[in-house]
């Protein structure tokens, strides 16, 4: 019962997490104009992974997509990639976990198969959550760097003649949604992995049986028998999924101004 609850809860938590990752990826407010030192502008700028938007005080909002692919900073591309990988892995994990749920019976699927599927989906959720957290953190780091760089030359002049206020960007709502969603997916994945242990058939210790041979009494006690689940000494399929294989060679220098228009 506890195993079913853990598995079910893990599935629900992961489902909410993945929905959050998708929402965060689609949101426009990854970075928003910093109003702390500049609350007087009648124009509010905010940017997402796919487009940048401007909301005028008159209520008019204009969004422009980043129609170039090669012209975008490598870091932005890396964040996009991490979020998409997270969504894809999460979606596959959800699909696998549906069939692995103990409360759903599919044909004559053995508990060992369900255990393996639960572990697979759990690992997928963990990697998915890590991808989302990594993506959001990379973007946040990019924002922090750009924030201080733009603060250093907040009032830059055209040859020192004209004062132009440089727009500074700070954390948008999507970053917090992404962090929370990534964390939930990660927690859901861990719960699935914990549930997997309980789903695996227990060790069946057969009681000693006395075989009465003619003439003299011989007691035969067979050793404890372990079912081949991949968790005992028989580790044929122990390494089901090798997560965490992510290249970091895309890390390049990025522009000081976080504008992709």
């Amino acid at each position: 019962m506890a195993v079913t609850a853990c598995q079910g809860l893990g599935f629900v938590v992961s489902l909410i997490g993945i929905a959050g990752i998708i929402a965060a990826t689609c949101m426009d407010q990854w970075s928003t104009q910093d109003l702390y030192n500049n609350p007087v502008t009648a124009v509010f700028n905010y940017q997402g992974l796919w487009r940048s938007c401007v909301r005028e005080s008159s209520g008019f909002t204009e969004c422009r997509g980043y129609f170039t692919l090669l012209g975008l900073p490598a870091m932005l591309q890396a964040v996009r990639a991490l979020m998409i990988v997270g969504i894809v892995l999460g979606a596959i994990g959800l699909l696998v976990s549906i069939f692995a749920l103990k409360c759903i019976r599919i044909g004559s699927m053995e508990d060992s198969a369900k255990a393996n599927m639960t572990l697979t989906s759990g690992i997928m959720f963990i990697v998915s959550g890590l991808c989302a957290i990594a993506g959001v953190s990379v973007f946040a780091n990019m924002l922090v760097t750009n924030f201080w760089m733009s603060t250093a030359n907040m009032y830059t002049g055209m040859g020192g003649m004209v004062q132009t206020v440089q727009t500074r960007y700070t954390f948008g709502a999507a970053l917090f949604v992404g962090w929370v969603a990534g964390g939930l997916t990660l927690i859901g994945g861990v719960m699935m992995c914990i549930a997997c242990r309980g789903l695996a058939p227990e060790e069946t210790n057969y009681k000693a049986v006395s075989y009465h041979a003619s003439g003299h009494s011989v007691a035969y006690k067979p050793g404890g028998f372990k079912a081949s689940t991949g968790f005992g000494s028989n580790t044929k399929n122990k390494k089901i999924y090798d997560g965490g294989a992510r290249t970091e060679d895309e890390v390049q220098s990025y522009p000081s101004k976080h504008d992709y228009v």
Epitope: T41, A42, V54, S57, S58, G59
Partner: antibody
Framework: VQLQESGAELVRPGTSVKVSCKAS????????IEWVKQRPGQGLEWIGM????????HYNEKFKVKATLTADKSSSTAYMQLNSLTSDDSAVYFC???????????WGQGTLVTVSA | DIMMTQTPLSLTVTAGEKVTMSCKSS????????????LTWYQQKPGQPPKLLTY???TRESGVPARFTGSGSGTDFTLTISSVQAEDLAVYYC?????????FGGGTKLEIK
């Protein structure tokens, strides 16, 4: 789009006056109503704005004490109350509908407020 | 507050002439987010409310004759009337739409000979 302002007012110093601006032929709650002051033979001064949908306001600091902006959705009418009037407040007051680029796209005909003892 | 300085104060021209008037802001009105300049031009004829001519520095409002052209970026802006007509007799104002409080220039009075 039409913005119909109330008629001219002759008021005593120290009193208050409420100018109205009735909007028609557009969705009143979808656009900001801006208020602008113009003294005779002078330039234009922005007083503030109101979002008729939410009731939210933003004032020019100079007019924060002087003007109070309100809106009535049911009658599609925006109001500006001017308090503690002095001769400096004698002017034509315009209401205007906000437009692209934070511009004032449509204007009322103006209300002349004369403060005189 | 942002200072909007308009020059000249007044212009006297003959019909058919080309006219340019200038507006300078004390700070850049260019928004980096959409690369648009938040400057608006208005025309105010005697005894009438102002009428919107251009917004975003150069976008002509619908119904405004093509002879009116707004240009410029950052802090320096220009309104050009390619061929002045008798009905263009008015005061022309520029307005900052980027910083609160919104501010207007002192105006340029256009007179026809």
């Amino acid at each position: 789009v039409q913005l119909q302002e109330s008629g001219a007012e002759l008021v005593r110093p120290g009193t208050s006056v409420k100018v109205s601006c009735k909007a028609s032929r557009y969705a009143f709650t979808n656009y900001l109503i801006e208020w602008v002051k113009q003294r005779p033979g002078q330039g234009l001064e922005w007083i503030g704005m109101i979002n008729p949908g939410s009731g939210g306001t933003h004032y020019n600091e100079k007019f924060k004490v002087k003007a109070t902006l309100t809106a009535d959705k049911s009658s599609s009418t925006a109001y500006m109350q001017l308090n503690s009037l002095t001769s400096d407040d004698s002017a034509v007051y315009f209401c205007a509908r906000g437009g692209f680029g934070n511009s004032f796209a449509y204007w009322g005909q103006g209300t002349l407020v004369t403060v005189s003892a | 507050d942002i200072m909007m300085t308009q020059t000249p104060l007044s212009l006297t021209v003959t019909a058919g002439e080309k006219v340019t008037m200038s507006c300078k802001s004390s700070q850049s009105l260019l928004n980096g987010g959409n690369l648009k300049n938040y400057l608006t031009w208005y025309q105010q004829k005697p005894g009438q409310p102002p009428k919107l001519l251009t917004y975003w520095a150069s976008t002509r409002e619908s119904g405004v004759p093509a002879r009116f052209t707004g240009s410029g970026s950052g802090t320096d802006f220009t309104l050009t009337i390619s061929s002045v007509q008798a009905e263009d007799l008015a005061v022309y104002y520029c307005q900052n739409g980027y910083f609160y409080p919104y501010t207007f220039g002192g105006g340029t009075k256009l007179e026809i000979k």
